[in-house]
């Protein structure tokens, strides 16, 4: 009977240790979750569903590249950099999806693309690269496409509402659609310097028959093909002051 | 009586706290001392007196600059770099004083200058800069000085024991002596690749009358005027492997 | 170079680094695009006076302590960041570096 | 940005950074040419569960603990190096950087 009690005590000890381990593991992970939110300057975890992510997540090369760049952490964790030891996360790339704007309305009241909202935290002089990525739908026959990016401005006396940012001519072959990037660094820097000048842009990609191939509002099966802005910034973390 | 006891207890408490504080302060500093020795890879604190330091410490510009470069820590400690968090100290500059060598003996058995001993830890490809600093005694009249740095080699068939490293001609005005630096990076790198080739060097700085102005063995009032080697290295701390 | 490594079956009582994987998918953090999981690790164990002591900047004596700190304790002495790709809840995807997310080494401090 | 600063007269019981000057001249370390003294600072104080917790990589619960680690403890969460000029006892003067010599911030870990 004594040995049975001993065995029970031992089992109980193991169970306690096990429960304790589970408990501390849970506490540890909870604490890490709090940390991550704090380091990313988020008050709560963004409320976004898997479906919403699937729709929003661009299918474009830069995103694939970012995801492929790491696994995100290899087993060999020390391959990473040495700890620079300031608290908050440093941002390297911001991928911004278009949002709706009052300025960008069609005659029928439907929104037009595209308005990009920027955080006042992005400083214009920290922008290293800014690319507008647009997806051009597949063509059935070889065709030349005229891509035009226009910037919406306050109406001028002659009624002009747009001014050109970039235009390019490219040849498309039948098959799959293509992602095209356009350098918009100067425009973005101006928007950051004068936020009131950011009224939105219009994207046109006309083939020889005048059909618009640019995906601005994704149709069925076009999730992740929205235009988006890829902004690379240098983020030298501020030193903490005491 | 009660209040007196209370007062005593309170005093005792303060004393205890005070003694504890002294004690922990001592412990903390002792631990920091152990740390420093460990980080500098020293088993014990080098046994060197203030007088020996005064004699050895070069009076040359690079040393003053190193001392002035930092306070060594300003009040604003965070002005320093962020912690790279690897354990050991990284070396940036090594100032090496000459030591005696069997090869470098004069006919009368007195040692000649200069033999520099190097740690096998210095890798030749990590050397960024290597300067030999020599002090030239003051002259009474304007004169031209011929500085010659010779490298001691194993005797050749024709009896040659030296080969030139550098020679330069400079004009000296009356007044105080001057420090002159000579680039010896290539020589040092060769010595590091082939340590057996490092037999020493000879320094000559002859004025127009054939007097040697180079301080090789300091006389009275010439402490800190020895020749020395200033070696700047890039020391990328090795990542720890697990 | 200092720092013990252990696993959950280890009998080591001294300060040691143990494995801990944080799995974002497991607790429904779909907003983190990558990584889906990462090895955070943690520190645990007892600290004798000088054992593994890296930063001697905490209390180092086991005596009555007016400020309630209990001598050196087992804590990270080397950490590294991870890169992360995530939605920030404002129609933006951010790629950045988060400092001090992985424990590379533990010691007494 | 986290981290409390206190002095010796402070009544703060929570985890805090306190001043500590290390004076090499005072204990006869003449072989250190510069600095002659430096501000090392130290950490001391009590840790509640989440207070000031920077690195959640140590034990975080106050329960019977098979490995004897007593919950989060007050420890450096940011450190910086100092530059030092010193004799190494081999006829050489070295100028280099010594990591983790100054406590810039304390937290519970």
């Amino acid at each position: 009977e004594g040995s049975e009690r001993e065995e029970n005590v031992e089992k109980e000890g193991l169970c306690n240790a096990c429960a304790w381990r589970q408990n501390t593991r849970y506490s540890r992970i909870e604490a890490i979750k709090i940390q991550i939110l704090s380091k990313l300057r988020l008050e709560t975890a963004p409320n976004i569903s898997k479906d919403a992510i699937r729709q929003l997540l661009p299918r474009a090369p830069p995103l694939r590249e970012l995801i492929d760049q790491y696994d995100v952490q290899r087993d060999d964790s020390s391959d990473g950099s040495l700890e620079d030891d300031d608290y908050h996360a440093t941002t390297e790339t911001i991928i911004t999806m278009p949002t709706e704007s009052d300025f960008l309305m069609q005659a029928d009241g439907k929104p037009k693309c595209c308005f990009f909202k920027f955080s006042s935290k992005i400083q214009y002089n920290k922008v290293v690269k800014a690319q507008l990525w647009i997806y051009l739908r597949p063509v059935k026959t070889p065709t030349t496409v005229f891509v035009q990016i226009l910037r919406l401005i306050k109406p001028m006396k002659d009624g002009t509402r747009y001014t050109g940012i970039r235009s390019l001519k490219l040849d498309m072959s039948p098959g799959t659609g293509i992602w095209q990037s356009i350098d918009v660094k100067t425009v973005l820097q101006n928007w950051l310097k004068q936020p009131e000048s950011n009224l939105g842009i219009e994207i046109k990609a006309l083939d020889e028959n005048g059909h618009d191939l640019a995906v601005t509002f994704p149709g069925p099966g076009e999730d992740g093909l929205n235009p988006f802005l890829e902004v690379k910034v240098t983020d030298t973390p501020k030193r903490s002051r005491r | 009586e009660g209040s007196e006891r209370e007062e005593n207890v309170e005093k005792e408490g303060l004393c205890n706290a005070c003694a504890w504080r002294q004690n922990t302060r001592y412990s903390r500093i002792e631990a920091i001392k152990i740390q420093i020795l460990s980080k500098l890879r020293l088993e014990t604190a080098p046994n060197i007196s203030k007088d020996a330091i005064r004699q050895l410490l070069p009076r040359a510009p690079p040393l003053r600059e190193l001392i002035d470069q930092y306070d060594v820590q300003r009040d604003d400690s965070s002005d320093g770099s962020l912690e790279d968090d690897d354990y050991h100290a990284t070396t940036e500059t090594i100032i090496t004083m000459p030591t005696e060598s069997d090869f470098l003996m004069q006919a009368d058995g007195k040692p000649k200058c200069c033999f520099f001993k190097f740690s096998s830890k210095i890798q030749y490809n990590k050397v960024v800069k290597a300067q030999l600093w020599i002090y030239l005694r003051p002259v009474k009249t304007p004169t031209t000085v011929f500085v010659q740095i010779l490298r001691l080699i194993k005797p050749m068939k024709d009896g040659t024991r030296y080969t030139g490293i550098r020679s330069l001609k400079l004009d000296m005005s009356p007044g105080t002596g001057i420090w002159q630096s000579i680039d010896v990076k290539t020589v040092l790198q060769n010595w590091l690749k082939q340590p057996e080739s490092n037999l020493g060097i000879e320094i000559k700085a002859l004025d127009e009358n054939g007097h040697d102005l180079a301080v090789t063995f300091p006389g009275p009032g010439e402490d800190g005027l020895n020749p020395f080697l200033e070696v700047k290295v890039t020391d990328t701390p090795k990542r720890s492997r697990r | 170079d200092f720092g013990l490594d252990c696993d959950e079956h280890s009998t080591e009582s001294r300060c040691c680094r143990y494995p801990l994987t944080v799995d974002f998918e497991a607790f429904g953090w779909d907003w983190i695009i990558a990584p889906k999981r990462y090895k955070a690790n943690y520190c645990s164990g007892e600290c004798e006076f000088v054992f593994l002591q890296k930063y001697p900047h905490t209390h180092l004596v086991h005596q009555a302590n007016p400020r309630g700190s209990a001598g050196p304790c087992c804590t990270p002495t080397k950490m590294s960041p991870i890169n992360m790709l995530y939605f920030n809840g404002k129609e933006q995807i951010i790629y950045g570096k988060i400092p001090a997310m992985v424990v590379d080494r533990c010691g007494c401090s | 940005d986290f981290g409390l600063d206190c002095d010796e007269h402070s009544t703060e019981s929570r985890c805090c950074r306190y001043p500590l000057t290390v004076d090499f001249e005072a204990f006869g370390w003449d072989w250190i040419i510069a600095p002659k003294r430096y501000k090392a600072n130290y950490c001391s104080g009590e840790c509640e569960f989440v207070f000031l917790q920077k690195y959640p990589h140590t034990h975080l619960v106050h329960q019977a603990n098979p490995r004897g680690s007593a919950g989060p403890c007050c420890t450096p969460t940011k450190m910086s190096p100092i530059n030092m000029l010193y004799f190494n006892g081999k006829e050489q003067i070295i100028y280099g950087k010594i990591p983790a010599m100054v406590v810039d911030r304390c937290g519970c870990s």
């Epitope: - | 203030k50 330091i53 005064r54 410490l57 009076r59 510009p61 690079p62 003053r64 600059e65 001392i67 002035d68 470069q69 930092y70 306070d71 060594v72 300003r74 400079l170 004009d171 005005s173 007044g175 105080t176 001057i178 420090w179 002159q180 630096s181 800190g224 | - | 040419i33 510069a34 600095p35 002659k36």
Partner: antibody
Framework: QVTLKESGPVLVKPTETLTLTCTVS????????ISWVRQAPGKGLEWVGI???????YYASWAKGRLTISKDTSKNQVVLTMTNMDPVDTATYYC?????????????WGQGTLVTVSS | DIVMTQSPATLSLSPGERATLSCTSS????????LSWFQQKPGQPPKLLIY???TLAYGVPSRFSGSGSGTDFTLTISSLQPEDAATYYC??????????FGQGTKVEIK
């Protein structure tokens, strides 16, 4: 012959910037520290700043933010620039070889140049 | 800030007398000996007399000597000569690129 010679404007208006040049001969600026020291009329010497042999700069605390010292080794010149001049900056400005208080620094001085700050 | 105090402000002595000038620093000079003494005559730049607290500069007469360590230093002129009438300054170095001069002691010959 080893010499140092200061040159620059004699008169500067308040709020203006002072630029002084120290031209050396017989001195190799890549081996020698150069200091600037000033002396207000009837007053004592006041350390201003140094440019080291390797080009590092050290400034007196009162001068930080206003002072810049630079050098052009090929021209044998060291330049002192002080912004936002004030009548209290009226002084004779000297350049000297080496650093007074370190080794035999300050063994050689220029003759000095008197700068008056007045509107 | 560092303060270097020289005393006396003025010293009036006869030729052949011994002059003792004092310099006190508010903090220890670097390595206890980063201190120099300078002589300045009206209309002239300063002249280096002593460095490393006690080392006589090149070409300076041996009647000048320096002593002291840390924060307290003395310049002694063993036998005053008429040409020694001048203002004397001490200069200290503190590491960290910090240097300072004393306010000067004026030596007059009666």
């Amino acid at each position: 012959q080893v010499t140092l010679k200061e040159s620059g404007p004699v008169l500067v208006k308040p709020t203006e910037t002072l630029t002084l040049t120290c031209t050396v001969s017989g001195i190799d600026l890549s081996h020698t520290d150069i200091s600037w020291v000033r002396q207000a009329p009837g007053k004592g010497l006041e350390w201003v700043g140094i440019i080291s042999y390797a080009g590092k700069k050290y400034y007196a605390s009162w001068a930080k933010g206003r002072l810049t010292i630079s050098k052009d080794t090929s021209k044998n010149q060291v330049v002192l620039t002080m912004t936002n001049m004030d009548p209290v900056d009226t002084a004779t400005y000297y350049c000297a070889r080496g650093v007074p208080a370190y080794s035999h620094g300050g063994d050689l001085w220029g003759q000095g140049t008197l700068v008056t700050v007045s509107s | 800030d560092i303060v270097m105090t020289q005393s006396p402000a003025t010293l009036s002595l006869s030729p052949g007398e011994r002059a003792t000038l004092s310099c006190t620093s508010s903090q220890s000079v670097y390595h206890a000996n980063w201190l120099s003494w300078f002589q300045q005559k009206p209309g002239q730049p300063p002249k280096l007399l002593i460095y490393w607290a006690s080392t006589l500069a090149y070409g300076v007469p041996s009647r000048f000597s320096g002593s002291g360590s840390g924060t307290d230093f003395t310049l002694t002129i063993s036998s005053l000569q008429p040409e020694d009438a001048a203002t004397y300054y001490c200069a200290g170095g503190y590491g960290g690129g910090r240097y300072a001069f004393g306010q000067g002691t004026k030596v007059e010959i009666k």
